[in-house]
């Protein structure tokens, strides 16, 4: 798969990791999370042109069929390939607890 | 996550498994695959409205941020949650061999 700097649509337009700042209110977490009050959410955003960061054989098939039948088969989509864990200080009935989530922040991205 | 029949956009419009018939030529495989000559490709197609088949916490975050910043953050995307293996009879330098691929056909779908 081609690397993230080799985007045929122009620099930064293809599938890659982006950071979006979000408050607990933005995330709908204010009623059950105490900290952090703001999260630097890493997520996968960008286009998936032909064979760019193709995750697997399925992604390659999808690219081929999208080219043939664009109204029926969508292009591959930019999604997390792996995640970084994140700890939340959660409200409980009796106070607070620390909880680690393994599927919250994208670590790197691919097209599928 | 809600099941595939509970699509708020109407039956069959949300993220689910579809089958697309494709020839070796369609897939660009004719030069290296001998059989099958045609594949029933299963893939994940459809919309991912709020919390529909959300794969994990990241998908839930994405939904929340897409609602707030639709021009910056895309909606979750319908992708394979797991795969069915498939055997190909491949051409080799000396003849043919059987090769099983584990990441070729979608088995079920989720939104991420």
């Amino acid at each position: 798969a081609r690397n993230g700097d080799d985007c045929p649509l122009g620099p930064g337009r293809c599938c890659r990791l982006h950071t979006v700042r979000a408050s607990l209110e933005d995330l709908g977490w204010a009623d059950w999370v105490l900290s952090p009050r703001e999260v630097q959410v890493t997520m996968c955003i960008g286009a998936c042109p032909s064979q760019f960061r193709a995750a697997n054989m399925h992604a390659q098939i999808k690219t081929s069929l999208h080219r043939l039948k664009p109204d029926t088969v969508p292009a591959p989509c930019c999604v997390p390939a792996s995640y970084n864990p994140m700890v939340l200080i959660q409200k409980t009935d009796t106070g607070v607890s620390l909880q680690t989530y393994d599927d919250l922040l994208a670590k790197d991205c691919h097209c599928i | 996550a809600r099941n595939g029949d509970d699509c708020p956009l109407g039956p069959g419009r949300c993220c689910r498994l579809h089958t697309v018939r494709a020839s070796l030529e369609d897939l660009g495989w004719a030069d290296w695959v001998l059989s099958p000559r045609e594949v029933q490709v299963t893939m994940c197609i459809g919309a991912c409205p709020s919390q529909f088949r959300a794969a994990n916490m990241h998908a839930q975050i994405k939904t929340s941020l897409h609602r707030l910043k639709p021009d910056t953050v895309p909606a979750p995307c319908c992708v394979p949650a797991s795969y069915n293996p498939m055997v190909l009879i491949q051409k080799t330098d000396t003849g043919v061999s059987l090769q099983t691929y584990d990441d070729l056909l979608a088995k079920d779908c989720h939104c991420i």
């Epitope: - | 059989s35 069915n84 293996p85 055997v87 009879i89 059987l98 056909l105």
Partner: antibody, heavy 118, light 107 residues
Framework: QVTLKESGPGILQPSQTLSLTCSFS??????????VGWIRQPSGKGLEWLAN???????YYNSALKSRLTISKDTSNNQVFLKISSVDTADTATYYC??????????WGQGTLVTVSS | DIVMTQSQKFMSTSVGDRVSVTCKAS??????VAWYQQKPGQSPKALIY???YRYSGVPDRFTGSGSGTDFTLTISNVQSEDLAEYFC?????????FGSGTKLEIK
């Protein structure tokens, strides 16, 4: 590494039902394109295809024997079964199971000899 | 049913020779024909797929050819371990059928 092994009763009497089991490893019958077939060979004679079953549970039978044949599978235990009802001496043969990929027999078991005798 | 005819029941050859085993189909098979080798006391082994493609691990002295109704398995530089019976099989349509076999004898 693909291996297949047939097992059967060895000997049975005319009019009985022959039950054969093919136990295999090295592939899965949940794989698209994969199947298992049964072939028999009377001593000193040629090969006769009997039946096969595919990953999607499609079943095909030799039309000459169809009314007597039943093929089934247990995907999770890597086994395929063949039953032949109302056997007679003409069913005496070595019975093979074979891994199939898109209609050819890629790997064969060692075979099991079945004798029908009164 | 499709009949696969192997007209030569026996063929005699010497080590180092070249020999051709033929198979004729009763109707057009395109290239949907396979060849198998069965050594004495053993189970059959796949040699050729789709008329001309050697299966992995099969020595390159085995060559398949043909399409339509006429098919040939050629063994060049015959070796003593090639002593076996050779069967063709059609998988163009059900029921799958085999040729009656050709036994290769080494002089």
């Amino acid at each position: 590494q693909v291996t297949l092994k047939e097992s059967g009763p060895g000997i049975l009497q005319p009019s009985q039902t022959l039950s054969l089991t093919c136990s295999f490893s090295g592939f899965s019958l949940s794989t698209y394109g994969m199947g298992v077939g049964w072939i028999r060979q009377p001593s000193g004679k040629g090969l006769e295809w009997l039946a096969n079953i595919w990953w999607n549970d499609d079943k095909y039978y030799n039309s000459a024997l169809k009314s007597r044949l039943t093929i089934s599978k247990d995907t999770s235990n890597n086994q395929v079964f063949l039953k032949i009802s109302s056997v007679d001496t003409a069913d005496t043969a070595t019975y093979y199971c074979a891994q199939m990929a898109y209609s050819w027999f890629a790997y064969w078991g060692q075979g099991t000899l079945v004798t029908v005798s009164s | 049913d499709i009949v696969m005819t192997q007209s030569q029941k026996f063929m005699s050859t010497s080590v180092g020779d070249r020999v051709s085993v033929t198979c004729k189909a009763s109707q057009n098979m395109d290239t949907n024909v396979a060849w198998y080798q069965q050594k004495p006391g053993q189970s059959p082994k796949a040699l050729i797929y789709s008329a001309s493609y050697r299966y992995s691990g099969v020595p390159d002295r085995f060559t398949g050819s043909g399409s339509g109704t006429d098919f040939t398995l050629t063994i060049s530089n015959v070796q003593s371990e090639d002593l076996a019976e050779y069967f063709c099989q059609q998988y163009n349509s059900y029921p799958f059928t085999f040729g009656s076999g050709t036994k290769l004898e080494i002089k």
